[in-house]
Interface confidence: medium
């Protein structure tokens, strides 16, 4: 004779509150006949949730048409959830007896925990922005989730990241709880594309984990490289130098162009472009009238860029005698 | 018109193995549990065995070991084999639906003699 | 096994009488009890199910009561038709047995 068996799948339940839960129980056979009844908690206070024969249990509903004969699926729903509702229920076997049925198998029982979703995790970077080869932290916190388990992952670029530490909050019985990480991340002069990914999973999130990105493009600061030319050719009687500031980010950049220390203001053009990694270069020309200059004329290019100290680079003019008489003769 | 019908009675000698069936027809059999009752001659009823939906299955102390019943749901039909037979299983034998909820017995065939003689 | 005991083992009656048949388990057997009744050569007829329950198609002139060990069978006005031998039977666990037998005659 085959041994009946009550499978109760899930070990642990997780709920919503105000949603509704479903209890799995098959049995593997029908004999002895008799009813299945579903409990909350064992022994003598055990609570009655279910009982197919008789009693009326308005929030719960069978998955399964019980009066088939042939049914042996006992699962069952409980509408609207709440915090009481929360405690282990066993689908029980009764067979015929007197003077009432007698409880013949049990199953393992499943637990029904309220079960809380995390919240999105927002990541924050540093406050201030930090140069390639630096180390830069990251944080990434949600909250309200429970049970308490749960798995949090750093990405950079798709890679993993493994310098990170974990805390969850708090350590002991809590209704919910909270997730903060802090991942350290070295920069790369190529990361104002990046992104960094925390990745929090959770039970209750069905296998779909929850993601916060944050762009290092908010905390790297590229610094450019200067470098100052002079054109060979010559406009009339000007000479076009040029200073070129490249791989620069962010954006934010003045440029001040000296002759001689004295500030000038007449940059004559510039033009702004941006690189595949996302750092710009910026191209400006500055036209020198070398009609009546003397030989020793320093011009100084400056940037000051995001706010940081001004990087200069200086150019001497280069002024032939044939340029002058060429200048003399050019000027009316 | 719900039935059941048995056949493969008949005399066989004390040691000797006989087949049952029971043809079902009118009802989705394979929804049923079913089951094998006797009569001896001028005597009262003495159930036989059980087959339940899933094919488990509890016999008497009385032909445990002996009897096997079993159920091919593709053919509605139901058998007992019966081996080792003594005299004393001498007996009209009957099939029976268990009906309700409760498997109390609402449909029963008309059966099938059993004579076990030397 | 439970051990079901009838009485009376025959009983004569007439035309129109109200008979009652008892039925009495060793051990309570709560209201898992059925009522057969069988004609000579023929098959058993089932008449009632949990004691008190009509099986379909049974007139209501049979009717059953009783919980525990003691259970009655009651047919109300006889009709040529009911006279036959009556069985009761325990089916709340295995092995299921059947009481001994009442056969109700013809007075």
């Known amino acids: 004779e085959e041994e009946l068996q009550m499978i109760q799948p899930e070990k642990l339940l997780l709920v919503t509150v105000g949603k509704t839960a479903t209890l799995h129980c098959t049995v593997t056979s029908l004999l002895p006949v008799g009813p299945v009844l579903w409990f909350r908690g064992v022994g003598p206070g055990r609570e009655l949730i279910y009982n197919q024969k008789e009693g009326h249990f308005p929030r719960v509903t069978t998955v399964s048409d019980l009066t088939k004969r042939n049914n042996m699926d006992f699962s069952i729903r409980i509408s609207s959830i709440t915090p009481a509702d929360v405690g282990t229920y066993y689908c029980v076997k009764f067979r015929k007896g007197s003077p009432d049925d007698v409880e013949f198998k049990s199953g393992p029982g499943t637990e029904m925990a309220l079960g809380a979703k995390p919240s999105a995790p927002v990541v924050l970077g540093p406050a201030a922005r930090t140069t390639p080869e630096h180390t830069v932290s990251f944080t990434c916190e949600s909250h309200g989730f429970s049970p308490r388990d749960i798995t949090l992952k750093w990405f950079k670029n798709g890679n993993e990241l493994s310098d990170f530490q974990t805390n969850v909050d708090p350590t002991g019985q809590s209704v919910a709880y909270s997730i903060r990480s802090t991942a350290r991340v070295v920069l790369d002069p190529w990361d104002v594309r990046s992104q960094v990914i925390c990745e929090v999973a959770h039970v209750t999130l069905q296998g779909d984990p929850l993601r916060g990105t944050a762009n290092l493009s908010e905390a790297i600061r590229v610094p450019p490289t200067l470098e100052v030319t002079q054109q060979p050719m010559r406009v009339g009687n000007q000479v076009n130098v040029t200073c070129q500031v490249r791989k620069f980010y962010p954006q934010s950049l003045q440029l001040t162009w000296s002759e001689n220390g004295n500030v000038c203001q007449r940059e004559t053009a510039s033009t702004l472009t941006e690189n595949k990694d996302g750092t710009y270069n910026w191209t400006s020309w500055f036209l020198v009238n070398i009609s009546d200059q003397r030989d020793d004329v320093v011009l100084t290019c400056q940037v000051k860029h995001d706010g940081q100290l001004a990087v200069s680079k200086r150019l001497a003019l280069e002024v032939t005698v044939h340029q002058k008489d060429q200048s003399s003769d050019a000027t009316p | 018109e719900v039935q059941l019908v048995e056949s493969g009675g008949g005399l066989v000698q004390p040691g000797g193995s006989l087949r049952l069936s029971c043809a079902a027809s009118?009802?989705?059999?394979?929804?049923?549990?079913m089951h094998w009752v006797r009569q001896a001659t001028g005597k009262g009823l003495e159930w036989v065995s059980v087959?339940?939906?899933?094919?488990?299955?509890y016999y008497p102390g009385s032909v445990k070991g002996r009897f096997t019943i079993s159920r091919e749901n593709a053919k509605n039909s139901l058998y007992l084999q019966m081996n080792s037979l003594r005299v004393g299983d001498t007996a009209v034998y009957y099939c029976?639906?268990?009906?309700?909820?409760?498997?109390?017995?609402?449909?029963w065939g008309q059966g099938t003699m059993v004579t076990v003689s030397s | 096994d439970i051990q079901m005991t009838q009485s009376p083992s025959s009983l004569s009656a007439s035309i129109g009488d109200k008979v009652t048949i008892t039925c009495r388990a060793s051990?309570?057997?709560?209201?898992?009890l059925a009522w057969f009744q069988q004609k000579p050569g023929k098959a058993p007829k089932s008449l009632i199910y949990?004691?008190?329950s009509l099986q379909s198609g049974v007139p209501s002139k049979f009717s059953g009561s009783g919980s525990g060990t003691d259970f009655t069978l009651t047919i109300s006005s006889l009709q040529p038709e009911d006279f036959a031998t009556y069985y009761c039977q325990q089916y709340v666990s295995y092995p299921y047995t059947f009481g001994q037998g009442t056969k109700l005659e013809i007075k």
């Open positions: 949990t004691a008190s």
């Open positions: 009118g009802f989705t059999f394979s929804s049923y549990d």
């Open positions: 051990q309570d057997i709560n209201n898992y």
């Open positions: 087959i339940g939906i899933a094919g488990d299955t």
């Open positions: 029976a639906r268990g009906g309700s909820w409760d498997d109390a017995f609402d449909i």
